[in-house]
Structure formats: structure tokens, C-alpha cells
Amino acid sequence: SDKLYQRKEPVISSVHTKVKGIAEVTENVTEGGVTKLGHSIFDTADYTFPLQGNSFFVMTNYVKSEGQVQTLCPEYPRRGAQCSSDRRCKKGWMDPQSKGIQTGRCVPYDKTRKTCEVSAWCPTEEEKEAPRPALLRSAENFTVLIKNNIHFPGHNYTTRNILPTMNGSCTFHKTWDPQCSIFRLGDIFQEAGENFTEVAVQGGIMGIEIYWDCNLDSWSHHCRPRYSFRRLDDKNMDESFVPGYNFRYAKYYKENNVEKRTLIKAFGIRFDILVFGTGGKF
Amino acid sequence: SDKLYQRKEPVISSVHTKVKGIAEVTENVTEGGVTKLGHSIFDTADYTFPLQGNSFFVMTNYVKSEGQVQTLCPEYPRRGAQCSSDRRCKKGWMDPQSKGIQTGRCVPYDKTRKTCEVSAWCPTEEEKEAPRPALLRSAENFTVLIKNNIHFPGHNYTTRNILPTMNGSCTFHKTWDPQCSIFRLGDIFQEAGENFTEVAVQGGIMGIEIYWDCNLDSWSHHCRPRYSFRRLDDKNMDESFVPGYNFRYAKYYKENNVEKRTLIKAFGIRFDILVFGTGGKF
Amino acid sequence: SDKLYQRKEPVISSVHTKVKGIAEVTENVTEGGVTKLGHSIFDTADYTFPLQGNSFFVMTNYVKSEGQVQTLCPEYPRRGAQCSSDRRCKKGWMDPQSKGIQTGRCVPYDKTRKTCEVSAWCPTEEEKEAPRPALLRSAENFTVLIKNNIHFPGHNYTTRNILPTMNGSCTFHKTWDPQCSIFRLGDIFQEAGENFTEVAVQGGIMGIEIYWDCNLDSWSHHCRPRYSFRRLDDKNMDESFVPGYNFRYAKYYKENNVEKRTLIKAFGIRFDILVFGTGGKF
């Protein structure tokens, strides 16, 4: 509450997160022209990345382009990219949508379609839909421990969200355990009125807001966090503005003296922890 | 403008960036003692790294030290590092400028120079200049889409910089399209009065400031972002304070039962997105 | 000091860090059943990761699980995980503490113990203590250069912590050189009343606070930073809340057409640079 007589000061915050959980992933894997069912286990080292304190990322879906090598190949025949003769292909041209630089030749992509030849990582990435349902949809059951240390330097006051009395096997619940700082990812989405299974396909950004409204006067001292959750990406976003949340990364290796890479397009949830609030003292 | 009767509140912000573009890189590559012209294509997975929302990095230049292995070798003969006898070399000594620990022996670096032998990743990194012009100088034509979601919790107000009416094929321009949130990297530098081609050699830090001055009163509601750009690193910085922006990272692999690495010294532009402003309401 | 007549504005900040130092690591290495002393050199590319400006991480300790492959194996026999018959093992069950999914069979872990068989990255990670003393305990002697650019947009004022007059071979000292922005990691801990050698074992989070109290009036202009240090993680934290600071990451490779990984549990110090303060002007 606004006590006008108080000297108010914004919070200085540091956050540390720890995600727990394993996912079982079943997908079709093609090897040597044969497609078979692949089954694998993903643990934290496979689906999350060492990020800063205020954000963490959980991969919920992916598309792999394996064994790419720098060479010439036909570009992917997305809308408007097909050609019938070399005239349609401009040597040296880089189409922002494409993944390479045109050589000027129009070449067969498959039995029925021709596209401009490009110098690129080949074969170029297929612009296919993210798998549905999401491959790591079971990430809904992962948990995250959030540790938050706060400081009001002007008031020389420091505290943290985890108190010695807390129980490390708790799970946050708005009513039954609002001070527990271990959150089930699915619960975060439910609290924010979002469907985890749906968002997991394309990815998204979820805000975890930690609000500290601290009264530091000794006679009415109060300083505990309040957690709330809201989706930060725009679920109604136009295609052209890249809906969801994904990024590409590569694993490089050498085979037969040629550098190759596996390109991974990782879809997932980026959780942003937004800490705010004030400390007031007479 | 400062409306003194209003209750002002600082902005809570979340940012998501997406870089687009490909670069054609031509450089001399030495293999088996033979130097030939190498040509390669870099796409987002090659030149950028999955970073947090408030920053993104675009590699514009690099120096590679390939096939390093943990062994003994002469250290690089930088200024003041040469020796003529073992007396000049101290066993166990770690020179902060050097990349290894001295064995105490003075050994030939090449036909004319001798340096102290070190236990290190060998051969040690040559302290050579960053290539000029920068290898990925064409990054000037890359574009970045910036999505910014803001919140004034006290006023229970949320908005974002991208509106449904916006066109995903726009490019930001201070006069013609100041609300477009797709920025050409070269334009950002031009707006900040900087030369991209020059900065790309050594790297640098560029600030993209997003200022929200929001009047949340219903009768004169206004809440749109204003973008401005300024260089954050000191271009006149003394050598000893490490001018530009670079970092080293390694790719590890095994060959002949020995762990090897390729060391990459990556120069580039780190873009920091600095969101600030207030929401005021009667 | 609080000048009530001044218009106060919070600081907008950008940070760039550069760590220097090499560590000599000696540890027992087992290869082909033979244990011998391993000795290696770690430089910045080995112990630090390209992170955002406001944080940097220095690895001080690690535990490796080499040559893991996706298959079936007995889970690690931690407290309460042993079994005597298949009844104790539930097919499809994922214990949050475990690293895999149970098959429903109880199998020998070693000559004396049996545990539930899991589908996982095998052999599963041994839950062994972090090495003591820490493998990279010499990181105490590493140094970090911190560059901080600040801006008060309302006052149109920009400055930085490194001035042209500064000497790049200085080291911060609270009394003798309080404006030097090159910090020895061990000194940071000493200033914060912490023992580096101790914290290096399990890891921790250290705050470097940069306080700018700026008087921007021309007649009494003052705007220089003040540095202070405090530990941000809770050293008295209960086991269940994951004390210290560590994360797992993996290096993937292929051998004999099977994907393998080396899992590294990296312990270390995350340094958070917390910049705050105000600019006041009449």
C-alpha cells in the first residue's frame, strides 16, 4: 500500500533457476533410406542451456537437418521460389527467406519441381511444420526451482524468497502454498490461462513476475514475494512476425575430411523472471 | 512530458529478437601446407548464439587456431617474450599475457627466434590482427526483428511494440517508418553516426534504446515506443583495456586418441536493447 | 546525498566483462582400466562461456561422465533407490531424482547392490561429491575487467567507469585504487568476507554492485562509480534447495555409428554485476 511518508526505493535483484525433469521422446528416424521408430531420453543437459539468471529456456520441440555440408543444391521450393529457366535465378542474389546465395542456374529439386541453385549448407533446411504434438510435450511435468535474492541498498536490507523453514519437496500453489518457489511448468501455464500442450508446439515466452512490496519499518515489517504469471509473446501474431519462440543452432563435425553440421531448429518456452517492487521506510 | 499530478511507474519489459541474413565469406585456408581460397556461407546458426532477450550477438569477424592439443610448445614471441637461454624462463610461471605455464626451457620458435617453452594448448594462438576488411562485413545487410512486451503492473496495463496493423515486410526508418520494429543492422549504425564496416573488424557494443513515455489516462491515452541508437563501447579505448568486442570459444574433438580443439576468437557486435520509460495515470 | 530540489532519474546501464587467467588442473584419469595422473591447462575458452554483459561465469570445479550412450542400465544406487525384486520397479515411472525411465526390472548395479533398470544416458551419472579441493581453485588469481557505460536519458548525460587517464595494469583495491575496474577474483571474495577456496568446490553467486550517485549540476558535478561486493547465494541452504551453483551441459559425438555424449557437471562462480543509482539535476 502507498505510504506517502515513506522513502521508497526500487529493488536490486539476482535470480538463480534450476530445472528438473526428464522427457521420453518418440519420433520417426530415417537412416540409410529406412524409416524406423526412434526412442530417446532427454535430460536437463539435452533440453536446456546454461542461460543467465533472469531467463531460462526449455526446449519442447525441434526439427533437425542432419549431415549438412557446404556445397551447391536447389533451394527449398517454398511459395514463389520455383523456377522454369535460368532467367528466374540471379547469380549472387541472397533472398532473405532463402538459406544461400544463388548461382544463376535453375535446377531440379525433385521429379516435379525446379528451384534456383544456391551455394549453402546442403541439403537446405526443409520448411516443414513443427511436429504436432510437440516432441517434448511431457516437459509440462518438469519443475523449476527459483531462488531470488533481493537488496535495498539505500535501506541496507537484504532478503531472499527461500526461507530456512521452507520444505524442498513443496510445489507452488496459489492458495495452498503461495510461498513455495518450486513451480511445475504446467501449473505456470494454467495460472496464466494458457495451454502448455498447444504452446509447446511453436514455443512461446512466459513471464514469471515476482513482486516485492516491502515495508521495512520495524513496527510493521513485511517483506515477502508475490508470484504471478503471464504470457509475454503474442499468440495472435501474424506469420510475418515469427510467432512462437524458436532459434537455430548447429553441431559441427568432420567426416571424410569435410566439415558437416547438424542444424537444430529448437522450439521451446523461454521463461523470463521479472522482479520488481519497492522497499519503503520512514 | 512531466505531468506532476500523475502517479508514475517504471516499465517492466521483456524482449525477443530474431536476426535474419546470410553472409558469404572468402578467406585463405591452409591445408597440408597448401594455401587456397576458401569460400563459405554463414547463416544464423553460424554467426549468432542463443542469447537472452535483452542482448543479441552477431559475429562479424574471426580468427581460428585449428587443431590445438595439450602439449609443450614455444610461446608466441610477442613483444618482450623472447629468450636466449633457459635462465630467462621460470618453471611453473604463468604470464597473464601468455597462454600456458613455463617449463623453464628456452626453445626455438622458428629459425630466428627463441621463446620460453610452455605447457598449453599448442600451437599457441598467434597474436595476429583481426582480418581487415572483416570476414562477415556483409552482416551490415542483416535485419533484426525486435519484439517488446511491456507492463505497468501498478496500472494493470500491458502492451507491445508490434501492433496487428503492422506490416512484416517493413524496415525501420526514423522518418518514414518510425514504428516498424525490423531494423537493418547497417541503418542502426548510420543512425548512431558509426561506420559498420569499421566497427565490424574489432567488434563493438551497440545500444538500441526503446523509450516508452506512456500517458495511461483514458482521455489522452498515448503509449508507443520511440527507438534511438548509440554506441556503448569506447572507440577511443586504450589497447590495455581491450577495445572492441570479442570472446574466445572452442570446439572440442578427439583424433588419434588425443583431445583436440579449434579455438575461435569471435569479433562482433553485441546489441543491447535498453528499455526504459514510465507509465503515468491520474 | 539526497538533494530534494533535484530531478532524480534512474541509471540506464550496459556492461562488458573480460576474464583473464589460466589454470593448471591435475586429476586422476582412468583410461582402459588404468588410472594415471592427468594434467591439463584451462584457458578462458575452457572455463568460461560467452554470456550476457550483466553476468559472467567462471568454472571452478567439475565432474565428468564420459562416453554415455542411450540404452538400458541400472540407475545409480542413491539413498532409497535400491531394490530386491521387480515389484519395487514400476515400468514407465520417472523418478525426478533419477536420470531415466524405469523398465520395471530390478537388476544388479554391482556385486552387492541391485537397482531398478532405466532407459537413460548410460552409464548413469554417479552422484559423487564435487572434488575437494576444487580442480580450478587457482581461478582465485584470475582477473576480470569490467567496462560499464551509463546513461541518464532525461538529462542527456552519458559516461563510463573507465577514464582515458586510467592504467590498464592496475588492480582494484578498496583503499589504494578504488576506481580501477580490473578485479582479482580472490579479492572480490575477500572484500565480501567469503573464502574463495571453499566456495569454489560447490560454486556460488557473487554480486558486484556498481553504485552511481551522480550530481549533474555544473557547479558541483560528480559522477563516479562505487564498487561493493556481496555473496548472493545462500551458503546455509538446505540440501533439498540445491546449494552452490552448478549446471550440466553435454558434448555430443558419434562413435561406431552410435551417438554418445560426455556430460559435464560444471560448478563455478556466477558473478552478477548489479548497476544502480540516480542522476540528479536542478
Partner: nanobody, 120 residues
Framework: EVQLVESGGGLVKPGGSLRLSCAAS????????MAWYRQGPGKQRELVAD???????NYADSVNGRFTISRDNVRNTVYLQMNGLKPEDTAVYYC??????????????WGQGTQVTVSS
């Protein structure tokens, strides 16, 4: 005690091939650079080829393209494959290695030498 033991020398006709081996034995921490030198009748000892622990190679101009140096880091062995041998390759071939007995305790070791004779 650390030793370098060579093998593979002998008599061969011009245009023929030989493969020399040299193995490091004993107790030590690490084998670093390895090399082959030779000393022809009435000549000074000269470098033939060397190889780093990271498999980088360097050859004398006179043997470049004919000789190949390689190493096996499991067996701590260096090899010299000699093809297109000429009479002027006749010499005693010595193995050389920089070996760390303990950490930061490098010593240079030589083998006893193996005779290679190229003659018709």
C-alpha cells in the same frame, strides 16, 4: 628408465620402401614432439621429419613427398614410412622425442639408431 627403441631398418634396393618404428617405454607423464633424424657417412646429423602431439608434421626438403611421419598416441610410437628410397638416403636413422617425466619436467631423448642402406 625411459627409453626409445627403434626397429625396421635394413638393406633395400633403390625405389624400394621401408617402415621405421620407434616406441617410448618406461614411466613418464606425456610424450610431446617426436621426430626422426639421420646421419649419413661423414655427414652431420640432420632432421628428416617431426610430428607434434597434435599430428602436425614437418619434413626436410630432400624427403618431402616420399617420406611420411605418423604417430600412435596409445602406443607412444612414431613411424617413418619411406618410399622411393635413393642411395643418398643411406644413413643411421635416430628417433627423437621430448618426454615429460612428470608435469613440467621435459627431457629430450634419443634412440640408439637403426641403419638404413639403399643399394642395388
Amino acid at each position: 628408465e625411459v627409453q626409445l627403441v627403434e626397429s625396421g631398418g635394413g638393406l633395400v634396393k633403390p625405389g624400394g620402401s621401408l617402415r621405421l618404428s620407434c616406441a617410448a617405454s618406461g614411466s613418464f607423464f606425456r610424450v610431446n614432439n617426436m621426430a626422426w633424424y639421420r646421419q649419413g657417412p661423414g655427414k652431420q646429423r640432420e632432421l628428416v621429419a617431426d610430428i607434434t602431439r597434435g599430428d602436425r608434421t614437418n619434413y626436410a626438403d630432400s624427403v618431402n613427398g616420399r617420406f611420411t611421419i605418423s604417430r600412435d598416441n596409445v602406443r607412444n610410437t612414431v613411424y617413418l614410412q619411406m618410399n622411393g628410397l635413393k642411395p643418398e638416403d643411406t644413413a643411421v636413422y635416430y628417433c627423437y622425442a621430448t618426454i615429460e617425466l612428470g608435469v613440467l619436467e621435459p627431457r629430450d631423448y634419443w634412440g640408439q639408431g637403426t641403419q638404413v642402406t639403399v643399394s642395388s
